[in-house]
Amino acid sequence: SITGISPITESLASLSTYNDQSITFALEDESYEIYVEDLKKDKKKDKVLLSYYESQHPSSESGDGVDGKMLMVTLSPTKDFWLQANNKEHSVELHKCEKPLPDQAFFVLHNRSFNCVSFECKTDPGVFIGVKDNHLALIKVDYSENLGSENILFKLSEILEHHHHHH
């Protein structure tokens, strides 16, 4: 369960891949498309509002008799639209929705190799947002393997301005 309905904090950031490609969002035919691309030097990076929530995973899951706390995040590149996991299609999509947000909009945040992060589906543990063929997709990661696979690593570059919703 997510502790409380309010985020503990929010930040505005641009999102890029481990290989420094930008995650961009474009409105096409009344819906948003998500792209992974090299940006021209003069082009401004798209902003994403990250809202951070605390989530409790019960001791039965954590296996240690202690309720472990996880950090969950929602990602919103424009007002009323959130990134969501489509587990059936193994895709990452932008959907317009109202609060309370569906579970598909929540991702467990993992810090990895210094200042990289990865986003694990709340609805499908072991499945992460990743890069596939210049698009975002859902990628299954075997926990016995190294979780540092570059295609699920992202960099957050915080944009220091007041955290009101953008656009």
Epitope: S62, G68, K69, N111, S113, E158
Partner: antibody, heavy 122, light 107 residues
Framework: EVQLVESGGGLVQPGGSLRLSCAAS????????MSWVRQAPGKGLEWVAS????????YYADSVKGRFTMSRDNSKNTLYLQMNSLRAEDTAVYYC???????????????WGRGTLVTVSS | DIQMTQSPSSVSASVGDRVTITCRAS??????LAWYQQKPGKAPTLLIY???SLQTGVPSRFSGSGSGTDFTLTISSLQPEHFATYYC?????????FGGGTKVEIK
């Protein structure tokens, strides 16, 4: 209840070695990022090394890189810090500390051991 | 590495006083700042995380605020058990870095 208990500290000559242990109870160590933080007598807190809960690491402060090695034994639920080529400036109380969040270091350290004193002197 | 500068380095106060400690980061750390209390001969204990969230079991006399580069820890009414040293720590970027500490002493 979460408990972290350090051991292995003591008096050692410059150039010598020590191995610190941090035994955890009440948590599964492998689920969390863990760090070693030290405090020289009368001074502030200094980060030494970390292993991430989500994989990655260990990572070391420049002041100890190449001399200290951090590891964990999941079967014993214990964290280690192997300290070689010790110097007088390594004299400090060494604490092990647990990340507040499973998988993320953004929340700081919510549990600390009591610390073990390492004195490097001839 | 991000440098954390705490001020003042020490403060003398009386029971019941309101005490404010500030922490400044050398670059923006959004809200990923933690505050710790440390008593002599003891390990630090977490008071505040994410700049303003109170750790479980910590009295509400403690509060934190700020984002970006400037942060504040406030003790609204100082109690005898609050005389200690307080440290801030940025948790936004690796490696974690601590402020130099603020010693709260009895006036």
């Amino acid at each position: 209840e979460v408990q972290l208990v350090e051991s292995g500290g003591g008096l050692v000559q410059p150039g010598g070695s020590l191995r610190l242990s941090c035994a955890a109870s009440g948590i599964t160590l492998s689920s969390y990022g863990m760090s070693w933080v030290r405090q020289a007598p009368g001074k502030g807190l200094e980060w030494v090394a970390s292993i991430f809960g989500s994989g990655g690491g260990p990572y070391y402060a420049d002041s100890v890189k190449g001399r200290f090695t951090m590891s964990r034994d999941n079967s014993k639920n214990t964290l280690y810090l192997q300290m070689n080529s010790l110097r007088a400036e390594d004299t400090a109380v060494y604490y092990c500390a647990k990340d507040r969040y499973s998988g993320s270091y953004y929340g700081g350290f919510d549990y600390w051991g009591r610390g073990t004193l390492v004195t490097v002197s001839s | 590495d991000i440098q954390m500068t705490q001020s003042p380095s020490s403060v003398s106060a009386s029971v019941g006083d309101r005490v404010t400690i500030t922490c400044r980061a050398s670059q923006g750390i959004t809200s990923w700042l933690a505050w710790y209390q440390q008593k002599p001969g003891k390990a630090p204990t977490l008071l505040i995380y994410a700049a303003s969230s109170l750790q479980t079991g910590v009295p509400s006399r403690f509060s934190g605020s700020g984002s970006g580069t400037d942060f504040t820890l406030t003790i609204s009414s100082l109690q005898p058990e609050h005389f200690a040293t307080y440290y801030c720590q940025q948790a936004n970027s690796f490696p974690p870095t601590f402020g130099g500490g603020t010693k709260v002493e009895i006036k």
